[in-house]
């Protein structure tokens, strides 16, 4: 997680800090949402289990021209050990339904808050 350095401080960011900053960014997105987020773009829903960060990035990276989630995309890349590019989707994640980005962000936020409370920072 050393690549997370640079979001808030010059050195490596502790996992707990990185997760807290991601949560704060998602809170910021949901609270500042006036018009439909990303113009109602649809993304693949994911299983909020193992490999969740990469799966979330794989899903959100397909959204183009949405400045509101660009920081989230960058932050998620710090949690994912491999490079993710648009159109990529791990065989670990089933493509069963698409949801609006706004709902995706809300679902992800709820889950990350739960992980933070339980002390699961990686």
């Amino acid at each position: 997680l050393t690549c997370l350095g640079g979001f808030a401080s010059p050195g490596p960011v502790p996992p707990s800090t990185a997760l807290r900053e991601l949560i704060e960014e998602l809170v910021n997105i949901t609270q500042n949402q006036k018009a439909p987020l990303c113009n109602g773009s649809m993304v693949w829903s994911i299983n909020l289990t193992a490999g969740m960060y990469c799966a979330a990035l794989e899903s959100l990276i397909n959204v183009s021209g949405c400045s509101a989630i660009e920081k989230t995309q960058r932050m998620l890349s710090g949690f994912c050990p491999h490079k993710v590019s648009a159109g990529q989707f791990s065989s670990l994640h089933v493509r069963d339904t698409k949801i609006e980005v706004a709902q995706f962000v809300k679902d992800l936020l709820l889950h990350l808050k739960k992980l933070f409370r339980e002390g699961q920072f990686n």
């Epitope: 113009n39 183009s64 159109g87």
Partner: nanobody, 116 residues
Framework: EVQLLESGGGLVQPGGSLRLSCAAS????????MDWVRQAPGKGLEWVST????????YYADSVKGRFTISRDNSKNTLYLQMNSLRAEDTAVYYC?????????WGQGTLVTVSS
């Protein structure tokens, strides 16, 4: 500029069929996955189906699985949705969408009304 123009909607009886088309321009159609999304009166957006760039992967919402078929003709820059065994709950405005873009790039949609 991305442009999408849906057509083929109309009034149909329950159990009937329709074929929707979406003519795309302004981008490399064959390079992108495409979606069908719908909005029922007074409801939110609902994803219907997605097809991969070359058409090898097709995905459907549970509510339409086995009844709807998505396809594409990259030589004509056109996306299709064959809708069979239509139900009243399929009544909605149907939009096609380039994956990863929101309604800023959608067309006007095509209205499908299922009623006896």
């Amino acid at each position: 500029e991305v442009q999408l123009l849906e057509s083929g909607g109309g009034l149909v009886q329950p159990g009937g069929s329709l074929r929707l088309s979406c003519a795309a321009s302004g981008f490399t159609f064959a390079g992108y996955s495409m979606d069908w999304v719908r909005q029922a009166p007074g409801k939110g957006l609902e994803w219907v189906s997605t097809i991969s760039p070359r058409g090898g992967g097709t995905y459907y919402a549970d509510s339409v699985k086995g009844r709807f078929t998505i396809s594409r003709d990259n030589s004509k820059n056109t996306l299709y949705l064959q809708m069979n065994s239509l139900r009243a709950e399929d009544t909605a405005v149907y939009y096609c969408a380039k994956e990863g873009t929101g309604f800023a790039y959608w067309g006007q949609g095509t209205l499908v009304t299922v009623s006896s």
